[in-house]
């Protein structure tokens, strides 16, 4: 796949000129070289105080690290100079230029195995395996709701083209080691797992190597279980009324549920002058429950049109789901059509009708 | 709750440059990558590019790489995207969007920044 | 790049119906397609990713299948708050494309 970006392998002590603001020059040195960067002023005009940054923080100078307006020089350099290097503008902290550099175990040049000196600062990728996109490297614990689908990947190039391997916990890692088997795409240097559960849990590895080198990045994968629960239906809902003979009237109820949900709505009723049973469940009756053609945006609404006296009680909003069940209630009070309203229940709204 | 609060509309001149930011919160700024898209009025959207927060390190499209500059301020969770040298071309309404790290997709958005360059 | 084409540019469709809206990519994009709902003023809302695992808290109403390089979305039992503009996303590289987008509107 086209990264759009531009690698190079830099041989010792090559200094390589900054590239375009916005863009990220990939570097790659062997260790024990000079790293050397170049940042010349935009369109050649003044470049003003500049600061040097290394992941984010500030170089300071030392017998190693050499700091110029323009140039930084790391001499012999280790895998801990990898990193991301830009020069900005100290005021503004503007980059003015970005590098991705990578330090490879072997010398950029001398003894390869066919003899061949690899060219120094010629654009062309030879060599040792090294991260094209290093910017996406360093996230390492992926923490993962489960049921989702998870992607690792490690972006590499080198010459001649690197193989890719993975493992698990050390160990070789193969599509008959988990039910729903893997994926593996060389081209995108991905590893994919469908529909993760927590048995997936633990630390993927990437190798990635030729036969100049060899390069690794792990990763910890956590599966987070969803706990399942009972339907939540929010505060508040629904709310208490107060409605004048003969208006609408409308209560809402509003759930949240993993599982389908069913919903009732119910209102409370006297039987023999009781409200509740001898077991003490209470006598309700069923508004409204699901049906074929029922949606659940149409069961968090209850609507009574044309209130009468008989109407006026407790309405209860009845959700569960294979967990368990959850409700709430609120009461509607029906006021005589003459009366003027003044004031509603605090709780309530007024429908005139 | 993850949000991605954007700054306010921008009416610049052309040849100008416009800064405008996405304030993260509702989650750990540092490990998620912040994508940039653009959407030119009655058009799809158009993907520029994203910055790891952690580290700096970008990834452009192309076709933006001369155009946008994309920064963050760690201290403050908030990601920037510079846009220069600005034409009627780039009139359109700009969004931030979060990387969801385990696959790659876009998960959360901001509520865009409209910007109009007109003389 | 990959393109992604996307169809129909617009449709009307009646409360409680179905509506079925299709990407095509110009390579296999290995079901890493999503699918977002944009309304006028807000950030694209993500209803589904990885072809057909839906998001949180996004109702079962909203579906997606495909493989390969054809993928499709759809909505039934359409409610009014459904108008909105539909786009893909296909997210398989390190270069994201969408597509042209899908306006939905209600007959």
């Known amino acids: 796949e086209s990264l759009g970006t531009e690698q190079r392998v830099v041989g010792r002590a090559a200094e390589v000129p900054g590239p375009e603001p916005g863009q990220q020059e990939q570097l790659v040195f062997g260790s024990g070289d000079a790293v050397e960067l170049s940042c010349p002023p935009p369109g050649g005009g003044p470049m003003g105080p500049t600061v040097w940054v290394k992941d984010g923080t500030g170089l300071v100078p030392s017998e190693r690290v050499l700091v110029g307006p323009q140039r930084l020089q790391v001499l012999n350099a280790s895998h801990e100079d990898s990193g991301a290097y830009s020069c900005r503008q100290r005021l503004t902290q503007r980059v003015l230029c970005h590098f991705s550099v990578r330090v490879t175990d072997a010398p950029s040049s001398g003894d390869d195995e066919d003899g061949e000196d690899e060219a120094e600062d010629t654009g062309v990728d030879t060599g040792a395996p090294y991260w094209t996109r290093p910017e996406r490297m360093d996230k390492k614990l992926l923490a993962v709701p489960a049921a989702n689908t998870v992607r690792f990947r490690c972006p590499a190039a080198g010459n001649p083209t690197p193989s890719i391997s993975w493992l698990k916990n050390g160990r070789e890692f193969r599509g008959e080691h988990r039910i729903g088997g893997i994926k593996l795409r060389h081209q995108q240097w991905s590893l994919v797992m469908e529909s993760v559960v927590p048995s997936d849990r633990g630390n993927y590895t990437c190798v990635v190597e030729n036969k100049f080198g060899s390069i690794r990045q792990t990763y910890t994968l956590d599966v987070l279980e969803r706990s399942p629960h009972r339907p939540i239906l929010q505060a508040g809902l629904p709310a208490n009324q107060t409605a004048v003979l003969g208006s609408d009237v409308e209560f809402h109820c509003k759930v949240y549920s993993d599982a389908q949900p069913h919903i009732q709505w119910l209102k409370h009723v006297e039987v023999n002058g009781s409200k509740v049973g001898p077991d003490g469940t209470p006598y309700v009756t069923v508004l409204k429950t699901a049906g074929a053609n029922t949606t659940d945006k149409e069961l968090e609404v209850l609507s009574l049109h044309n209130v009468t006296f008989e109407d006026a009680g407790e309405y209860t909003c009845l959700a569960g789901n294979s967990i368990g069940f959850s409700h709430h209630s609120a009461w509607l009070v029906v006021l005589p059509a003459e009366e003027e309203l003044v004031e509603a229940d605090e709780a309530g709204s007024v429908y005139a009708g | 709750e993850v949000q991605l609060q954007q700054s306010g509309p921008e009416l610049v001149k052309p040849g100008a440059s416009v800064k405008m930011s996405c304030k993260a919160s509702?989650?750990?700024?540092?490990?998620?990558?912040m994508h940039w898209v653009k959407q030119s009025h009655g058009k799809s959207l158009q993907w520029i590019g994203y910055?790891?927060?952690?580290?700096?390190?970008?990834n452009y499209n192309q076709n933006f790489k001369d155009k946008a500059t994309l920064t963050v301020n760690k201290s403050s969770t908030t990601a920037y995207m510079e846009l220069r040298s600005l034409t009627s071309e780039d009139s359109a309404v700009y969004y931030c969007?979060?990387?969801?790290?385990?696959?790659?997709?876009?998960?959360?958005w901001g509520q865009g920044t409209s910007v109009t360059v007109s003389s | 790049d990959i393109q992604m084409t996307q169809s129909p540019s617009s449709l009307s469709a009646s409360l409680g119906g179905k509506v079925t809206i299709t990407c095509k990519a110009s390579?296999?994009?290995?079901?890493?397609i999503a699918w977002y709902q944009h309304k006028p003023g807000k950030g694209p809302r993500l209803l589904i990713h990885?072809?057909?695992t839906l998001q949180p808290g996004i109702p079962s109403r909203f579906s997606g299948s495909g493989s390969g390089r054809d993928y499709s979305f759809s909505i039934s039992n359409l409610e009014p708050e459904d108008i909105a503009t539909y786009y893909c996303?296909?997210?398989?590289?390190?270069?994201?494309?969408f597509g042209g987008g899908t306006k939905l509107e209600i007959k």
């Open positions: 969007a979060r990387e969801r790290d385990y696959d790659g997709s876009m998960d959360f």
């Open positions: 509702g989650y750990t700024f540092t490990d998620y990558n």
């Open positions: 910055i790891n927060p952690n580290n700096g390190g970008t």
């Open positions: 390579q296999d994009i290995n079901k890493f």
């Open positions: 990885y072809t057909s």
């Open positions: 996303l296909q997210y398989d590289n390190l270069l994201w494309t």
